[in-house]
C-alpha cells in the first residue's frame, strides 16, 4: 500500500521540514520562516509557538519541530507541553483568584504551589502532637498519650554506646 501511495501521491515523498506545495505542481517546498512540519507528506506547515510574556523559550522552533516554552521565574508550568503558567506563592500561602493568601489556621502549604492542606489529626492514629503545625509545616505526631504515662517504657531505645573519642556522625 505504501508503495502504491507514493506512486499515486507525490506529496508522500515530502520530508519533515517541507510541505507539498499545490501552487507549484506539488513539489516539496521548505517551510517558511516561523513555521514547521514534524512529519513527512504534509500539505501545510504549522505556525511556530511563540513564547512571550510569562512564557520563556526553552527550545527554539526549527523547520521540523515546534518551539517549547517554560515559565519565567516566579511561575510554574501547568498543562501538557506547558500550555499555561501559574504564579508561585510563598510557602504558607495558596493562590486564589484574589492573589496569594496565607493559609488559614489549621492548614499548611510547604510548597510554592498548590493549596493549603489540613494539619494531620494525630489523634486519629491514637498519637499526640509532638511539634505544633504552622502555615508552612504540618504537625509532627509523636507517641500516643498512653506511651507517655508515668511508668511506661521509653519510646525510643537508648542510643548504642560509642567508643570514647568518637563524635556522632
Amino acid at each position: 500500500f505504501e508503495r502504491t501511495r507514493s506512486l499515486q501521491d507525490p506529496c508522500s515523498n515530502c520530508p519533515a521540514g517541507t510541505f507539498c506545495d499545490n501552487n507549484r505542481n506539488q513539489i516539496c517546498s521548505p517551510c517558511p520562516p516561523n513555521s514547521f512540519s514534524s512529519a513527512g507528506g504534509q500539505r501545510t506547515c504549522d505556525i511556530c509557538r511563540q513564547c512571550k510574556g510569562v512564557f520563556r523559550t526553552r527550545k527554539e522552533c526549527s523547520s521540523t519541530s515546534n518551539a517549547e516554552c517554560d515559565c519565567t521565574p516566579g511561575f510554574h508550568c501547568l498543562g501538557a507541553g506547558c500550555s499555561m503558567c501559574e504564579q508561585d506563592c510563598k510557602q504558607g500561602q495558596e493562590l486564589t483568584k484574589k492573589g496569594c493568601k496565607d493559609c488559614c489556621f489549621g492548614t499548611f502549604n510547604d510548597q510554592k504551589r498548590g493549596i493549603c492542606r489540613p494539619w494531620t489529626n494525630c489523634s486519629l492514629d491514637g498519637k499526640s502532637v509532638l511539634v505544633n503545625g504552622t502555615k508552612e509545616r504540618d504537625v509532627v505526631c509523636g507517641p500516643s498519650p498512653a506511651d507517655l504515662s508515668p511508668g511506661a517504657s521509653s519510646v525510643t531505645p537508648p542510643a548504642p554506646a560509642r567508643e570514647p573519642g568518637h563524635s556522632p556522625q
Epitope: G53, V54, L78, G79, S83, M84, C85, E86, Q87, L95, T96, K97
Partner: nanobody, 123 residues
Framework: EVQLVESGGGLVQPGGSLRLSCGAS????????MLWFRQAPGKGLEWVAN????????YYVDSVKGRFTISRDNAKNSLSLQMNSLRAEDTATYYC????????????????WGQGTTVTVSS
C-alpha cells in the same frame, strides 16, 4: 490566531492618570477570565488585577486597590485598566493575559499574553 495587543502606555507625572487597553482576537473573549500583570525594571512579574467573564468579579493586588480599576467590554473584545493617582513605583511594563480554560475552578494559570505596554511615572 489567538492574540492580545496592549496599548495606552506612556510617560505620566506622579498623581496623574492613564488608561491601558488590551484588544483580543482569535477567541471567544466573553468566555475567559482576563488579567493584568506588570514587570518593573529589574523585578519579577507581578499580578495586578483580574476580572471574570461578565465583569461581576474583580480583584486587585493590595498596592493598587482604590487607584486602579479593571473593566471589560465583551462586545468590543477589549480589556481596560484605568490607573489613577499614579506613583513612581507603578513604573513597569504592563501585560494583559488570558486565564486558561478552567481558571478559578481548578487552577489560576494563564495561557495567552500580549507583548506589553510600558508605563513610566516620573516628574
Amino acid at each position: 490566531e489567538v492574540q492580545l495587543v496592549e496599548s495606552g502606555g506612556g510617560l505620566v507625572q506622579p498623581g496623574g492618570s492613564l488608561r491601558l487597553s488590551c484588544g483580543a482576537s482569535g477567541f471567544t473573549f466573553s468566555t475567559y477570565w482576563m488579567l493584568w500583570f506588570r514587570q518593573a525594571p529589574g523585578k519579577g512579574l507581578e499580578w495586578v488585577a483580574n476580572i471574570n467573564q461578565d465583569g461581576s468579579e474583580k480583584y486587585y493586588v493590595d498596592s493598587v486597590k482604590g487607584r486602579f480599576t479593571i473593566s471589560r467590554d465583551n462586545a468590543k473584545n477589549s480589556l481596560s485598566l484605568q490607573m489613577n493617582s499614579l506613583r513612581a513605583e507603578d513604573t513597569a511594563t504592563y501585560y494583559c493575559a488570558r486565564g486558561g480554560d478552567g481558571y478559578s475552578d481548578s487552577h489560576f494559570g494563564t495561557d495567552v499574553w500580549g507583548q506589553g505596554t510600558t508605563v513610566t511615572v516620573s516628574s
